[in-house]
Interface confidence: low
Amino acid sequence: MLSHAGPARFALFLLCCMETLLPSHMAPTHRLQPSDVRKIILELRPMSKGLLQDYVSKEIGLPESNHSSLPCLSSDSQLPHINGSAILPYFRAIRPLSDKNTIDKIIEQLDKLKFQREPEAEVSMPADNFERKNFILAVLQQFSACLEHVLQSLNSGPQ
C-alpha cells in the first residue's frame, strides 16, 4: 500500500522506467514491440492532455508540480517502457474525480503495458482538500510529461 503524503514530491515515482532495468520476475509476460508501445502512447496522449487541460481550467491557481522529480527515462539507449503496473494505482485513485470515460480508456491502455507478474499497489487519495487537488494535478501533469518523453525517445529511435 502506498501513502499519499507529499503527492507532488513522490507521485508516480515509478511512472516510467526502462523495461530492461526490471528484474526478470517483473518482466512482461509478452514483450511489446516499440511500434505497439508507440501506438498505445499515441492513444494515451490526447486523453492525458485533455484531462489535464480540463482539470487546470477548473482549478486555476494550483501550483505546477515538479516534473523534474519524475524518473521517466533512463540514460540507457534501449527501449523506454512505461510501467503500467506503477501508474495504474494512481489512475484508479483519481478515477472518482476525473472524467469517467476518459479514465476508463486510459486504464484500458495502461493495462496493456502492465508488468503482469508484479502485484499492483493500492494508492489512496489525500483526505485534505488542497492536497487532493495537488495530487490529481501531479498525476496528470507528470503522466503527460512522461508520455511526451517516451514518445520523443521512440520517435528518435528505430521504428
Partner: antibody
C-alpha cells in the same frame, strides 16, 4: 453484461450474525470499488459499507462500524458482508453495488432480504 | 455527516410536463470543480438505477430527457418531458465525504 448476485439473506434473531455474499461477473471485478447499500421496507436508501478495489481501504457509517465487516476475494469475484450483533433496525434488503472508483454507484444487484426479529 | 434534503417529497405530474426535483446538502459537496452528487431512480419493486453522476453527467443508456445541474450545496434533477414510465422514487446521493448519504427520496406519480 454486468451482473451482481447477492445471497445469504435470512431471518435472524437480534444479537445474531449473518454473512452476505455477492458474486460479480461481466466486468473486471478487481478494478472496481464495491459497496453495500440497504433499504428498510418502505423506506429510503442507506449506505452500509464500501471497500476499495484492492481491499486495502474500507469505510462504514458510525451506526455500522464495529458490527459489520466488508471484505472481498478478487480471485473469486466475490464481495462479502459479515454482519454481527444484528438489531431489529438492520432489517432491510441489502444491495451489492459496483462503485466507480470510490464514487458513483453504477450497477446494483437484485438485493437479498435480511430480517432481524425475535 | 452531510445531510441531504430533497424537495418535494412527492409530486404528481402529467405526461409531457417538465419536472424538477431539488436536493440541498448541508455543506458543499463540490470538489475540484465537480459536484459529487448523483441521482438514482427506483421504480416500484425494482432496484435503484443510476441516472446522473457527478451532478450533470448522463449515465449511459439513460434517456436524454433527464438532466442534472448544480454545484456547491444546491442540485437539481430535471425531466424535460415526462413519460409514463418515469413514475418512480428519485434519490440524490453525495460522495464528497464519508459517510455517503442519500436524500429521503421524491416519489413521482403520473396523472
Amino acid at each position: 453484461d454486468v451482473q451482481l448476485v447477492e445471497s445469504g439473506g435470512d431471518l435472524v434473531k437480534p444479537g445474531g450474525s449473518l454473512r452476505l455474499t455477492c458474486v460479480a461477473s461481466g466486468f473486471t471485478y478487481s478494478n472496481y470499488g464495491m459497496s453495500w447499500v440497504r433499504q428498510a421496507p418502505g423506506k429510503g436508501l442507506q449506505w452500509v459499507a464500501t471497500i476499495s478495489y484492492g481491499g486495502s481501504y474500507t469505510y462504514y457509517p458510525d451506526n455500522i462500524k464495529g458490527r459489520f465487516t466488508i471484505s472481498r476475494d478478487n480471485a473469486k469475484n466475490t464481495l462479502y458482508l459479515q454482519m454481527n450483533s444484528l438489531k431489529t433496525e438492520d432489517t432491510a434488503t441489502y444491495y451489492c453495488v459496483r462503485g466507480y472508483g470510490y464514487d458513483t454507484m453504477d450497477y446494483w444487484g437484485q438485493g437479498t432480504l435480511v430480517t432481524v426479529s425475535s | 455527516e452531510i445531510q441531504m434534503t430533497q424537495s418535494p417529497s412527492s409530486l404528481s405530474a402529467s405526461p409531457g410536463d417538465r419536472v424538477t426535483i431539488t436536493c440541498k446538502a448541508s455543506q458543499s459537496v463540490s470538489f475540484a470543480g465537480t459536484g459529487l452528487m448523483h441521482w438514482y431512480q427506483q421504480k416500484p419493486g425494482k432496484v435503484p438505477k443510476l441516472l446522473i453522476y457527478r451532478a450533470s453527467n448522463l449515465e449511459a443508456g439513460v434517456p436524454s430527457r433527464f438532466s442534472g445541474s448544480g454545484s456547491g450545496t444546491d442540485f437539481t434533477l430535471t425531466i424535460s418531458s415526462l413519460e409514463p414510465e418515469d413514475a418512480a422514487t428519485y434519490y440524490c446521493q453525495q460522495s464528497r465525504e464519508y459517510p455517503w448519504t442519500f436524500g429521503q427520496g421524491t416519489k413521482l406519480e403520473i396523472k
